[in-house]
């Protein structure tokens, strides 16, 4: 007689990453009987919600329900019906909503309220929508990549099961770049973390970790661009801004009201004698780099050493995974290879930015012009942030690994968030037989 396969005893979880520029839904799956083991949770689906980030719905909250429909229906299809009621759904909003909350707590609450109402109509176990802190975003990103890289497993292996693995239990640092903020998180080497706000203590799988983290609000790639434009237009002699961060021949009209809409440009705000200005690209990497550096205040540091803007940063230690927009931008520019030195990256950026806009449009005909036009800025910004902001050097550059996925799961904060909220990261190392557990991150 043929053996009938038993129904697989699996569990699912859903996390929505409500970022500043868009929302993505991730579906995770794991064997129910192994949920305390490290590395068993994996991503089975990613669904990118069509449209902008949720903070952009502040004047049209009635459209939020429709906005979320396609991806929530996709989740309904992917997850077996019998599992719907047991599947937790979490939504975490990041820097786009932090910025909206800074402008108006009432408006941010209204958006979150409607998001919660909309998501609660699905047959899942909805666990709420909230704005996560920058510290959480950094910490959960760090947990995600180290969980996926097998760094929390106490079993040492003589072979590598995942890329980037260095066959030791040294954790990777995490570098996350979003549209509105950027996070740096790592375990410093025997260094006291001088500012308590940047210190995290974890006990994971029986081991203690003292982790440094900081989230730089307004230093995501989109908000950094707005900052740069607001800074540069201050000294423009008329309504034409000759911008080295855009390709030669590129032209775009910007509304001053849009420029000053974000809290990130408040420090540069001034009364201008025009309502609009035109960006005219001149495509010069070096000048673009110099302009970006003016966004980083390195003249003041109340600690032994700082990143920028007076924020403590310990000496860099070990390998780093750079993900989210760090990866997407560098992948587009074909600069993610481990073999490409920092000098080579800089050279390639110089060439790329100098290419005429018409040529770029022809070479990348399938890419939306809005995104295509900003790769010169974004690539230059990544180099400036990593080298001058975080003090990576030409030598330590080789310790940065641009990571999109690890073992099929996206690098980012969402997996770490779900692992924590579902109590799947025990403080102590689980024994071979599953035990009840109560202490978690």
């Amino acid at each position: 007689t043929q053996n009938k396969a038993l129904p697989e005893n699996v569990k699912y979880g859903i996390v929505l990453d409500a970022g500043s520029s868009h929302t993505s839904l991730y579906i995770y799956k794991w064997p129910a009987e192994k949920e305390n083991d490290t590395g068993v949770v994996h991503q089975v689906e990613e669904c990118r919600v069509k449209g902008p980030g949720i903070s952009k719905f502040v004047q049209k909250v009635n459209e939020i329900g429709i906005y979320l429909t396609d991806c929530m229906e996709r989740a309904r299809e992917v997850i077996p019906r019998s599992q719907h009621q047991e599947t937790p759904v979490y939504l975490g909003a990041t820097a786009g909503m932090r910025l909206l909350r800074m402008e108006s707590e009432e408006l941010a609450d209204r958006v979150l309220d409607v998001v919660e109402r909309s998501l609660s109509n699905y047959p899942f176990d909805f666990q709420g929508a909230r704005i996560i802190t920058g510290q959480e975003e950094g910490a959960y990103g760090w947990i995600t990549i180290n969980y996926l890289l097998g760094k929390f497993s106490q079993k040492t292996r003589w072979f590598s099961i995942v890329p980037y693995e260095t066959n030791n239990q040294e954790t990777f640092g995490a570098l996350d770049l979003g549209g509105a903020s950027t996070q740096v998180t790592f375990v410093p080497q025997n260094q006291t973390i001088e500012s308590p706000d940047n210190a995290l203590q974890f006990r994971l799988y029986g081991k203690d970790y003292n982790v440094y983290t900081h989230s730089f609000l307004c230093y995501g790639k989109d908000q950094a661009l707005w900052q740069k434009l607001a800074k540069d237009i201050q000294v423009a002699s008329n309504e034409i801004l000759r911008d080295p961060c855009f390709h030669p021949g590129y032209k775009k009209v910007v509304n001053v009201s849009d420029l000053y809409k974000t809290p990130c440009t408040k420090r540069f705000e001034m009364t201008l004698p025009f309502q609009q200005f035109e960006i005219q690209g001149i495509g010069n990497y070096q000048q673009c780099h110099q302009s970006i550096l003016e966004l980083f205040n390195t003249s003041y540091c109340p600690y032994s050493q700082c990143a920028f803007n007076g924020i403590f940063l310990p000496p860099l230690q070990g390998d780093f995974g750079a993900f989210s927009a760090f990866y997407f931008v560098m992948k587009f520019l074909n600069l993610t290879s481990e073999k490409v030195s920092q000098e080579k990256v800089t050279e390639m950026m110089k060439k790329f930015c100098a290419q005429p806009w018409e040529e770029i449009k022809t070479s990348y005909a399938g890419v939306k012009e809005k995104y295509l036009s900003e790769y010169c800025f974004s690539g230059t910004y990544i180099l400036s942030l990593l080298l001058q902001g975080y003090h990576f050097t030409a030598d330590s550059w080789e310790h940065i690994h641009f990571i999109g996925k690890i073992q099929g799961s996206d690098a980012g904060w969402t997996l770490g968030y779900m692992l924590n909220l579902t109590n799947m990261i025990p403080a102590e190392q689980p024994l071979s037989t599953p035990l009840s557990h109560s202490t978690y991150v």
Partner: antibody, heavy 121, light 107 residues
Framework: QVQLVQSGAEVKKPGSSVKVSCKAS????????ISWVRQAPGQGLEWMGS????????NYAQKFQGRVTITADESTSTAYMELSSLRSEDTAVYYC??????????????WGQGTMVTVSS | EIVMTQSPATLSVSPGERATLSCRAS??????LAWYQQKPGQAPRLLIY???TRATGIPARFSGSGSGTEFTLTISSLQSEDFAVYYC?????????FGGGTKVEIK
């Protein structure tokens, strides 16, 4: 101070529908949510669903999904709760109640007087 | 959904005595908890919100405490008008859920 005034008692046949109204007097709904809560004879309180009249956004308890429809008419400051495919277990007092705030502030600070709905053949 | 459990189901107390009612949530609701009083033939009335803040017009003898999963409503000195059914309700997450109620009756 806003008051919520509900429509009168109803007797309905199994399989039919009922529509209960809830009018805000002495004020408007504003941007407050309106929840509907029912109470079967001798039983506790059971939340059915909610609407933000300003936006027409409704959400429902899973138990009632597909059977209840909550709507609102801002111009008359009236909310409605329609329950279809009625059965005897739906015999209850149905209350509308105003939610006092928005995000995670859904305490119910003003209640209607209740509408008795009896389902009997 | 979050399950709210109230105890005891019935509490017999003499007028002037103290009454302590308990409410437990199946997961943490922070301080997003309300208490209601309901008398026969009447709609419920909001007494306490935010776990411990008295609603407008509620006498000082009513007090709420707790956070997370364990909550208490205390009536310091029961008056004749306080004999009623009391419900707790969480409003952290949808669906809004109520406890089964505690009936406070005259001993």
């Amino acid at each position: 101070q806003v008051q919520l005034v509900q429509s009168g008692a109803e007797v309905k046949k199994p399989g039919s529908s009922v529509k209960v109204s809830c009018k805000a007097s002495g004020g408007t709904f504003g941007s407050y949510g309106i929840s509907w809560v029912r109470q079967a004879p001798g039983q506790g309180l059971e939340w059915m669903g909610s609407i933000i009249p300003e936006f027409g956004i409704a959400n429902y308890a899973q138990k009632f999904q597909g059977r209840v429809t909550i709507t609102a008419d801002e111009s008359t400051s009236t909310a409605y709760m329609e329950l279809s495919s009625l059965r005897s277990e739906d015999t209850a007092v149905y209350y509308c109640a105003r939610e006092s705030g928005t995000y995670r502030d859904h305490r119910l600070d003003v209640w209607g007087q209740g509408t008795m709905v009896t389902v009997s053949s | 959904e979050i399950v709210m459990t109230q105890s005891p189901a019935t509490l017999s107390v003499s007028p002037g005595e103290r009454a302590t009612l308990s409410c437990r949530a199946s997961q943490s609701v922070g301080s997003n908890l309300a208490w209601y009083q309901q008398k026969p033939g009447q709609a419920p009335r909001l007494l306490i919100y935010g776990a411990s803040t008295r609603a407008t017009g509620i006498p000082a003898r009513f007090s709420g405490s707790g956070s997370g999963t364990e909550f208490t409503l205390t009536i310091s000195s029961l008056q004749s008008e306080d004999f009623a059914v009391y419900y707790c309700q969480q409003y952290l997450l949808w669906p809004l859920t109520f406890g089964g109620g505690t009936k406070v009756e005259i001993k």
